[in-house]
């Protein structure tokens, strides 16, 4: 969490951002809130990016003002216009690119004063893993697949019964480049699994951590997946 305060001149207002991560090819949110103001027509929101000449986005007098917008963000940004009056300056970024990573500034002017806060935005790819029993294999084998990751993650297997065990000798992980030549498909196979046990396939890079669990018993198979972004710090 980053909390910024206003600059000299008018009163300062509190602006708060939260570091976040964007998933390449999907839409992302750059989070920013500020002390609300009931005078909507006086509110100005500017999003800037370090190293970029033009603005990322500008909202003033109740609407987008995009004449100064940088080419790299053209047609890809929007604020939640209906939420500005209650202090939400968050930016929606469409079709996140690898190059969108960097330091952003959320700069706010209201009738009460000015304020700004920076935000670190990471970009990459992350997806939920799915763990299945591989019936084609000669021995009891689990196959963990996740369609899109970048940068290349690490994959670690764990088991509820054999807690702390190292499965690197009985697992094999491969990374296959996807058609857009950036993200990769992750496939990890675990051999010699035992019945009545819960296995977890954990995939992690510097942006996200995802876990796929599978419980195999005589009568049924239960699966569960979970994904967590690693760098959500407020400012």
């Amino acid at each position: 969490l980053i909390i910024g305060f206003g600059i000299s001149g008018r009163h300062s207002i509190t602006v708060t951002t939260v570091a976040s991560a964007g998933n390449i090819g999907e839409d992302g949110i750059l989070s920013c809130t500020f002390e609300p103001d009931i005078k909507l027509s006086d509110i100005v929101i500017q999003w800037l990016k370090e190293g970029v000449l033009g603005l990322v986005h500008e909202f003033k007098e109740g609407k987008d003002e995009l004449s100064e917008q940088d080419e790299m963000f053209r047609g890809r940004t929007a604020v939640f216009a209906d939420q500005v009056i209650v202090g939400n300056a968050s930016l929606r970024l469409k079709n996140v690119q690898l190059t969108d990573a960097g330091t952003y500034k959320c700069y706010i002017i209201t009738s009460k004063g000015k304020g700004n806060a920076n935000l670190e935005y990471k970009t990459g790819a992350f997806s939920m893993p799915e763990v299945n029993v591989d019936y084609n294999a000669s021995s009891e084998t689990l196959r963990c697949e996740a369609p899109r990751w970048f940068p290349q993650p690490t994959v670690v297997w764990a088991s509820q019964v054999d807690q702390g065990a190292n499965f690197s000798e009985v697992s094999n992980t491969s990374f296959e480049l996807n058609s857009e030549n950036v993200t990769m498909k992750v496939v990890s196979v675990l051999y010699n699994v035992t019945i009545n046990n819960t296995y977890s396939c954990m995939i992690e890079n510097d942006i996200a951590k995802a876990t796929g669990d599978i419980k195999v018993t005589e009568s049924e198979i239960k699966r569960r997946s979970h994904l967590q972004l690693l760098n959500s710090k407020a400012s």
């Epitope: 005078k39 216009a81 009056i85 209650v86």
Partner: antibody, heavy 117, light 107 residues
């Protein structure tokens, strides 16, 4: 869930003052504006003013400037509206209304103030 | 201050009718307009925000539209529980101002 609970009906004499309370629960009281709107019998809605409890910032409609005072007690999440120098045309129902997710999204049940000699 | 002119001030309609209420602002309010429904002895109920977005729990027979200075609330098929007074509110310019109200009565 969000609730705005106002104090009970009041009967006042001309020239007196009235203080209406509005107790809030269900959202962070200090971080969002609380407004006051009144409605005379059979009439429309009229905005009176607003307070930002976190900093006690206030904004008043010009018509009520100098006669209305908005305050907030952050320890009890209660907003207050005091109207002084009452006259018969101040007979109305007074509402508190929040701007939490949107402008005037939640309303108190209303407090009837009758000014009569 | 921005003036909001609401019309008609009252109308009579039957269950199943399509009802349209308009609000005109004295200047561009950039879609910063909400609609409220009020029944006798009750506080106003939040209906539509930012011109066209339905508040939580509001039936889909209600819809809002408009831009610039002209805005409309439409009830596609009037139900018995919709007989009430409707108000528009602009919050673009300070101070926020309400329309005069439209009373929807049973024909």
């Amino acid at each position: 869930q969000v609730q705005l609970v106002q104090s009970g009906a009041e009967v006042k004499k001309p020239g007196a003052s009235v203080k209406v309370s509005c107790k809030v629960s269900g959202y962070p009281f200090t971080s969002y504006y609380m407004h006051w709107v009144r409605q005379a019998p059979g009439q429309g809605l009229e905005w009176m003013g607003a307070i930002y409890p976190g900093k006690s910032d206030t904004e008043y409609a010009q018509k009520f400037q100098g006669r209305v005072t908005l305050t907030a007690d952050t320890s009890t999440s209660t907003a207050y509206m005091e109207l002084s120098s009452l006259r018969s045309e101040d007979t109305a129902t007074y509402y508190c209304t929040s701007t939490w997710t949107h402008y005037f999204d939640y309303w108190g049940q209303g407090t009837t103030v009758t000014v009569s000699s | 201050d921005i003036q909001m002119t609401q019309s008609p001030s009252s109308l009579s309609a039957s269950v199943g009718d399509r009802v349209t209420i308009t609000c005109q602002a004295t200047q561009d309010i950039v879609k910063s307009l909400n609609w409220y429904q009020q029944k006798p002895g009750k506080p106003p109920k939040f209906l539509i925000y930012y011109t066209a977005q339905l508040a939580e729990g509001v039936p889909s027979r209600f819809s809002g539209s408009g831009s610039g200075t002209d805005y409309t609330l439409t009830i596609s098929s009037l139900q018995s529980e919709d007989f009430a007074t409707y108000y528009c509110l602009q919050f673009y310019e300070f101070p926020p101002t309400f329309g005069g109200g439209t009373k929807v009565e049973i024909k």
